[in-house]
């Protein structure tokens, strides 16, 4: 069977700007291998041109001129002689839109132009992006490699320019962002932030970028422990926060982290193994109570470590006062006076407004303090008669604030009254 | 630096609902508590109520815990509070705030009108 | 709930002159207490947190005491920037602002 001209190559094709493309082609042609074996020469031309006189876009004859506009960048791929006519465009460019017929050429039988298969070649604007390869989870603190490529790009035409931009990279030598390839050792700051890769061609107004979000794992940092919305203070990993006893308490704990800590709170400092009274960053307190002083730990427990924060809790209470009550005895008027207080309170007498400090150095009053339980008590002995109505007070008073009490002694009177008069510093 | 920007002014009708935002930018959105004051014209400071975006905790005004509902999401670092049957008691200007150990930064308000 | 009154609601004070404003709780506020100045079109600022702390980056004429109930700001030396609105807030139970001072310069 005699060989025919013959081209398949399919009719059209699309690449987007700067990308590459491979048309496949195969041809046939007559040609008996008993024939002198003059050199096989193939050509693509642009539509339109005439063989004799024109540049060629890709041939595989040394001596045939090429547009320099497709120097580089439209090669033959694939074995000629194997009837492959195969065309690599490479770094398109919407000038390249059109189409381009096959020529072959051997001795001086074969000369032939396929102009009924010709490749229509259309160049549409970028629209791909490049690809951020990496591999995840980053781990803040941990070294990682990433690479960007742009898929569907090759080699052919000018080199590929890279720029990576984001607040990841602000420690970096700007010479390392315009490798395709980075190393990047993130930072907990670094979670959630973008990351840019941005591709060119030099000398071409084509660019592309993809941007990332940045997904870094991290233990906790740092504990905040949040009484209504504002932060405890913390001095060496504790914090201190003054309590009314009777108040509610709602403390909530966070310890930025991701993936997100589990946080628990503790009684006292506890052993790893200890049991939370609350399995979640919220601590409640319905109403502190003084057996509740001493605090409470926040822990934190993440997969990458665990934190924790001590919440040292002192629970005070204003002056609470009983008395004074008055009673007279053998060896005088004797007045006792009842307060409670967290901290301990101190507590004065007074005689007629005027304090009564100690013991008298003439003898004429004697104060004796005791305490039991919660209760502080303080006696005054007022020794000789009364000459006249008198007014005997105690006060007690913390750094929270202050509670007295009087009780107006009338001459030849024995019934006492009393009155209970709180104030504040 | 910590930046919170709101939405715009808003003219919505009485009986509407409207959704004002606040955008937490330049730092950790999820760690603060942000809070929403109200100012009517020419009136003094009135606090709404807070969230904290990490937990999802929020506290509220007694006042307000029928009209206002507060909402984050922590993917655009935004800050939502939800007014809901609007009258003109409610034409105010927002704002929103975050805390740390006081009121540290401020968005800028957003003036809402409610009128037929 | 916390009732914070603020007094005055408005005053007139000289350029160089010292001047105070006072807050007082309806209870036992714990020092949970802090100060801001508001001019007009603007948002709040704050001067003063934990009754006593002044902000970095606020003047140091500017000054807060105060315990229990019974708080108080103090401008040592009043200059022009510092006419404005003055508000006190209370956070140790939820949050209460006083009334507001309007302070304008004589």
């Known amino acids: 069977e005699k060989p025919v001209y013959e081209l398949q190559v399919q009719k059209s094709v699309t690449v987007q700007e700067g990308l590459c493309v491979l048309v496949p082609c195969s041809f046939s042609y007559p040609w008996r291998s008993w024939y002198s074996s003059p050199p096989l020469y193939v050509y693509w031309f642009r539509d339109g041109e005439i063989p004799y006189y024109a540049e060629v876009v890709a041939t595989n004859n040394p001596d045939r001129r090429v547009k320099p506009e497709t120097q580089g960048r439209f090669r033959l791929l694939g074995d000629v002689q194997k009837k492959n006519c195969s065309l690599s465009i490479g770094d398109a460019r919407m000038e390249d839109t059109g189409s381009y017929f096959f020529r072959v050429e051997r001795g001086r039988d074969v000369k032939y132009s396929y102009q009924q298969n010709k490749l229509n070649l259309e160049v549409t604007a970028l629209i791909e992006k490049p690809d951020i390869h990496f591999l995840e989870p980053l781990e803040s603190g941990r070294p990682t490699r990433l690479s960007c490529s742009l898929p569907g790009s090759c080699e052919a035409g000018p080199p590929l320019t890279f720029s990576w931009t984001g607040n990841a990279l602000s420690p970096l030598d700007p010479e390392t962002t315009r490798s395709s390839e980075l190393t990047l050792t993130p930072r907990p700051e670094d979670h959630g932030t973008n990351l840019t890769c941005q591709m060119k061609r030099q000398g071409a107004q084509v660019t592309t970028e993809r941007t990332v979000q940045l997904n870094v794992s991290y233990a906790p940092q740092t504990i905040t422990i949040f009484r209504n919305g504002i932060a405890l203070e913390i001095l060496q990993n504790t914090s201190y926060l003054p309590v009314l006893e009777g108040q509610a308490l709602r403390l909530l704990c966070d310890a930025p982290s991701n993936p997100p800590a589990h946080l628990s709170w503790f009684q006292g400092s506890p052993a790893l193994n200890a049991t939370p009274i609350s399995n979640t960053g919220i601590l409640e307190l319905r109403r502190v109570r003084s057996a509740e002083e001493g605090g409470f730990t926040c822990r934190a427990q993440h997969p990458l470590g665990f934190l924790q924060i001590f919440l040292n809790l002192s629970v005070y209470s204003l002056p609470q006062l009983l008395g004074p009550s008055c009673s007279w005895e053998a060896e005088g008027l004797h007045c006792r006076c009842s307060f409670r207080a967290r901290p301990a309170p101190s507590l004065c007498w007074r005689l007629e407004e005027k304090p009564l400090e100690g013991n008298s150095s003439q003898g004429s009053f004697k104060v004796n303090s005791s305490s039991a339980g919660p209760w502080a008590n303080s006696s005054l002995i007022l020794h000789g008669g009364l000459s006249s109505d008198l007014k005997v007070s105690c006060k007690a008073w913390n750094i929270y604030g202050s509670q007295s009490g009087s009780v107006l002694l009338l001459q030849g009177r024995s019934n006492l009254g009393t009155g209970v008069v709180p104030a504040a510093l | 630096q910590a930046y919170l920007q709101q939405s715009g002014a808003e003219l919505v009708k009485p009986g509407a609902s409207v959704k004002l935002s606040c955008k937490a930018s330049?730092?950790?959105?999820?760690?603060?508590?942000l809070h929403w004051v109200k100012q009517r014209p020419g009136q003094g400071l009135e606090w709404i109520g807070m969230?904290?975006?990490?937990?999802?905790?929020?506290d509220y005004n007694e006042r307000f815990k029928s009209k206002a509902t507060l909402i984050v999401d922590k993917s655009s670092s935004t800050a939502y509070m939800q007014l809901s049957s609007l009258t003109s008691e409610d034409s105010a200007v927002y704002y929103c705030?975050?805390?740390?150990?006081?009121?540290?930064?401020w968005g800028q308000g957003t003036a809402l009108t409610v009128s037929s | 709930d916390v009732v914070m009154t603020q007094s005055p609601s408005s005053m007139y004070a000289s350029l160089g002159e010292r001047v105070t404003i006072t807050c007082k709780a309806s209870?036992?506020?714990?020092?949970?207490l802090s100060w801001f100045q508001q001019k007009p079109g603007k948002s709040p600022k704050t001067l003063i947190y934990?009754?006593?702390r002044l902000v970095d980056g606020v003047p140091s004429r500017f000054s807060g005491s105060g315990s229990g109930q019974d708080y108080s700001l103090t401008i040592s030396s009043l200059e022009y920037e510092d006419m404005g609105i003055y508000y006190c807030?209370?956070?140790?139970?939820?949050?209460?602002f006083g009334g507001g001072t309007k302070l304008e310069i004589k």
């Open positions: 705030a975050k805390t740390f150990y006081y009121f540290d930064y």
């Open positions: 330049g730092y950790t959105f999820t760690s603060y508590w």
């Open positions: 969230i904290h975006p990490n937990s999802g905790s929020t």
């Open positions: 209870q036992d506020i714990n020092s949970y």
């Open positions: 934990r009754a006593n």
């Open positions: 807030l209370q956070y140790d139970e939820l949050y209460t």
